[in-house]
C-alpha cells in the first residue's frame, strides 16, 4: 500500500522536511502533490510526469518545493503555515490512481523567554505576586523553576494561563527565588534569565546580644541589636524608657551599678511601617560571675529506717551565695522530718524513712551564677547494720 512519511515529523521553522513515499506501484505515469487531506486541483503543489521527467508548479506552490523522480517531496525553509496534511496522487499508466496522505508539524525555534512580574517588591504575608513567562506562543509548553528545582507542591503556588503564569499567594521572605521559566516545543527549548523577588518583611522581634545579664563594675557594656528585616531595620536604644541613640550598637564604657536597668532595643522598618522592641535587664554587681562547685558530705550513707538520723553538709568557699537542696530532682525540704540549718549548709533528716533513700545534691548560687555538687547516695534499710560515719561520696 502506498504510504508517505514525513522526515522529520516535527520540523523547526526555517528548516526542511522531506515527504518520503513508500511502496510506489509499478507502471507509473506521473505524480501530483496537493496541500490538504484530499486531491484538490486548486491546492496542487506540483505535478510530475515520469515520461518527460518534467515537473510543473500548481496553484499551491510556494517556490520552496522540489519533487523527485521517486515521488518524494522536499519542502525547504518551512513556515508554520506549512503545518498540516499533504496528499500524493500517483497516476498509474492504466489511469487507476492511488493516493496517500501524510502530515508534519512546523514549530518555531523558540526565543529566550523573559519573566514579567506584577509586583517586584511584595510585602511578606500580605501581597501576591504573578510571574508571567513571555512571549506567548502557540503549541508551547511552559515550565517553571525555583532555586533550580521544579515547582514544589504548595497551596501558595498556582499555575494558570496554560502554565504561562505562576502566582505566589501571600509571599514569604523565603520566596526570593531565583525564578526561571522555560519554554519547550518538540524542536527547541529555552530558559529565561533568573529573576529574584525583593520581599519586604519585618522587622521580627529584635535580639540583643550578648545574652549576659550580669556585669562587674568597671567593665565595658557593649550591646548589639538585630532584627530580621528587609529593608534593614533602623534601630534605637532606650535605657529605663529614656531615648539614648539611633544605632544598632550601644556602647557604655566603665559601667557602674548605676548603669543597671532595662535596656530597650527598638527596630523599625520604614517600608512595612512595622516596629518591634525587645527589653533586656542589665545588672551591674560585685558578685562573682562564676560560682565554684560545692562539696557534699553525709554523716552516714547507710542508715536504719525509723531509727537513725542523717546530716548532709554542702560546703563552698564562695561568699554571698545561697544554697538549695535537691532529692530525686525535687527541691527540699519535702517533709517535716527534714530541716535546713546554718544558712542551708546542713540538711538534717530525723528520723530517716524508707522513702528517703536515693540521690541527694546541693546547688550554690548567686544572682549571676550557680553550680551544683556531685550527687550522694543515701541507703536506708531495716536490719541492724554496723554504722559508717563520715563517709565522703563514692
Amino acid at each position: 500500500q502506498l504510504t508517505t512519511e514525513s522526515m522529520p515529523f516535527n520540523v523547526a521553522e526555517g528548516k526542511e522536511v522531506l515527504l518520503l513515499v513508500h511502496n510506489l506501484p509499478q507502471q507509473l505515469f506521473g505524480y501530483s502533490w496537493y496541500k490538504g487531506e484530499r486531491v484538490d486541483g486548486n491546492r496542487q503543489i506540483v505535478g510530475y510526469a515520469i515520461g518527460t521527467q518534467q515537473a510543473t508548479p500548481g496553484p499551491a506552490n510556494s517556490g520552496r518545493e522540489t519533487i523527485y523522480p521517486n515521488a518524494s517531496l522536499l519542502i525547504q525553509n518551512v513556515t508554520q503555515n506549512d503545518t498540516g496534511f499533504y496528499t500524493l496522487q500517483v497516476i498509474k499508466s492504466d489511469l487507476v490512481n492511488e493516493e496517500a496522505t501524510g502530515q508534519f508539524h512546523v514549530y518555531p525555534e523558540l526565543p529566550k523567554p523573559s519573566i514579567s512580574s506584577n509586583n517586584s517588591n511584595p510585602v511578606e504575608d500580605k501581597d501576591a505576586v504573578a510571574f508571567t513567562c513571555e512571549p506567548e506562543t502557540q503549541d508551547t509548553t511552559y515550565l517553571w523553576w525555583i532555586n533550580n528545582q521544579s515547582l514544589p507542591v504548595s497551596p501558595r503556588l498556582q499555575l494558570s494561563n496554560g502554565n504561562r503564569t505562576l502566582t505566589l499567594l501571600s509571599v514569604t521572605r523565603n520566596d526570593t527565588g531565583p525564578y526561571e521559566c522555560e519554554i519547550q516545543n518538540p524542536v527547541s527549548a529555552n530558559r529565561s534569565d533568573p529573576v529574584t523577588l525583593n520581599v519586604t518583611y519585618g522587622p521580627d522581634t529584635p535580639t540583643i546580644s550578648p545574652s549576659d545579664t550580669y556585669y562587674r563594675p568597671g567593665a565595658n557594656l557593649s550591646l548589639s541589636c538585630y532584627a530580621a528585616s528587609n529593608p534593614p531595620a533602623q534601630y534605637s536604644w532606650l535605657i529605663n524608657g529614656t531615648f539614648q541613640q539611633s544605632t544598632q550598637e550601644l556602647f557604655i564604657p566603665n559601667i557602674t551599678v548605676n548603669n543597671s536597668g532595662s535596656y530597650t532595643c527598638h527596630a523599625n522598618n520604614s517600608v512595612t511601617g512595622c516596629n518591634r522592641t525587645t527589653v533586656k535587664t542589665i545588672i551591674v554587681t560585685e558578685l562573682s560571675p562564676v560560682v565554684a562547685k560545692p562539696q557534699i558530705k553525709a554523716s552516714k550513707t547507710t542508715v536504719t529506717g525509723d531509727k537513725d538520723s542523717v546530716n548532709l553538709t554542702c560546703s563552698t568557699n564562695d561568699t554571698g551565695i545561697s544554697i538549695r537542696w535537691f532529692f530525686k530532682n525535687q527541691s527540699l525540704p519535702s517533709s517535716e522530718r527534714m530541716k535546713l540549718s546554718q544558712g542551708n549548709t546542713t540538711l538534717s533528716i530525723n528520723p530517716v524513712k524508707r522513702e528517703d533513700a536515693g540521690t541527694y545534691w546541693c546547688e550554690v548560687f548567686n544572682p549571676i551564677s550557680k553550680n551544683q555538687s556531685d550527687p550522694i547516695m543515701l541507703n536506708v534499710n531495716y536490719n541492724a547494720l554496723p554504722q559508717e560515719n563520715g563517709l565522703s561520696p563514692g
Epitope: F29, G41, G47, A49, L95
Partner: antibody, heavy 127, light 110 residues
Framework: EVQLLESGGGLVQPGGSLRLSCAAS????????MSWVRQAPGKGLEWVSG????????YYADSVKGRFTISRDNSKNTLYLQMNSLRAEDTAVYYC????????????????????WGQGTLVTVSS | QSVLTQPPSAPGTPGQRVTISCSGS????????VTWYQQLPGTAPKLLIY???HRPSGVPDRFSGSKSGTSASLAISGLRSEDEADYYC???????????FGGGTKLTVL
C-alpha cells in the same frame, strides 16, 4: 460509478440558443478539466470547447468562437455549454468528456485526453 | 478537412495485425502527446491510448500506440470481430490553442 449525463438538446431554429448541461457523478468533479465534443450525423468527432478544473482557462474551436460559452458549477457538479446564434452546421450529438490527468508538466495541454464520456445529447438546428 | 490525417478505412481479418496511421504537424503531434479513441457503432467514444502509448485500465494489450516526429500510429494485433469500430486520433494543437481530431478510420474485420 463514474458517469456523465448530458441534457438540454433538442430542435432549435437557426439563430436560436440552447444551453446544454452535463451532470457528473462518481468522482470529484472540481478536480478535472472538462470538454465538449460533437459529432455531426455520419461524421467524425469534433472538439468544441474545454475548461480547466477551476474555470481559470477556457478554450474554443474556431468554428464556435464568439457563439458558444463553456462554464461549470463545481458546487453542482455540472458542466454547461451555452450555444447562441446556432447554425445548421451545429447540428450534432454533443458529448461532454473528462480529462483524466492533472497538470503534470509546465505545458498542461500536452497530455490532453478524454477518458470518460457521456452518452450524448442531440442538437438539431433546423427551420 | 481535419487537422490530423487518418486513412478513412482499414480492413483486416481475424487474428491479423492492423496499423492505423495519424499524420499531423509540428504544432500538434510534433509538440504534444497523441490520444486514440475507439467508437463502436451507436455508442460514445472510448479512450484507447493516451500519451502516445499508455493504455488505460480495461484496454486489452492487443492495442498499442507509438509516435515518431509528427506522425503516430495505432496497432491492433490478434484482430477480433468486436474490434470493428471507428478509430480517432487526437492531439492538442498549439497554433489553434485547441484540441484536434483526425477524420477517423473505419476498421472492418472481414
Amino acid at each position: 460509478e463514474v458517469q456523465l449525463l448530458e441534457s438540454g438538446g433538442g430542435l432549435v431554429q437557426p439563430g436560436g440558443s440552447l444551453r446544454l448541461s452535463c451532470a457528473a457523478s462518481g468522482f470529484t468533479f472540481s478536480n478535472y478539466d472538462m470538454s465538449w465534443v460533437r459529432q455531426a450525423p455520419g461524421k467524425g468527432l469534433e472538439w468544441v470547447s474545454g475548461i480547466s478544473h477551476s474555470s481559470g482557462s477556457k478554450y474554443y474551436a474556431d468554428s464556435v468562437k464568439g457563439r458558444f460559452t463553456i462554464s461549470r458549477d463545481n458546487s453542482k457538479n455540472t458542466l454547461y455549454l451555452q450555444m447562441n446564434s446556432l447554425r445548421a452546421e451545429d447540428t450534432a450529438v454533443y458529448y461532454c468528456a473528462r480529462d483524466p490527468l492533472p497538470c503534470l508538466i509546465p505545458k498542461c495541454s500536452y497530455y490532453y485526453a478524454m477518458d470518460v464520456w457521456g452518452q450524448g445529447t442531440l442538437v438539431t438546428v433546423s427551420s | 478537412q481535419s487537422v490530423l490525417t487518418q486513412p478513412p478505412s482499414a480492413p483486416g481479418t481475424p487474428g491479423q495485425r492492423v496499423t492505423i496511421s495519424c499524420s499531423g504537424s509540428s504544432s500538434n503531434i510534433g509538440s504534444n502527446a497523441v490520444t486514440w479513441y475507439q467508437q463502436l457503432p451507436g455508442t460514445a467514444p472510448k479512450l484507447l491510448i493516451y500519451a502516445d502509448s499508455h493504455r488505460p485500465s480495461g484496454v486489452p494489450d492487443r492495442f498499442s500506440g507509438s509516435k515518431s516526429g509528427t506522425s503516430a500510429s495505432l496497432a491492433i494485433s490478434g484482430l477480433r470481430s468486436e474490434d470493428e469500430a471507428d478509430y480517432y486520433c487526437g492531439s492538442w494543437d498549439d497554433s489553434l490553442n485547441a484540441y484536434v481530431f483526425g477524420g477517423g478510420t473505419k476498421l472492418t474485420v472481414l
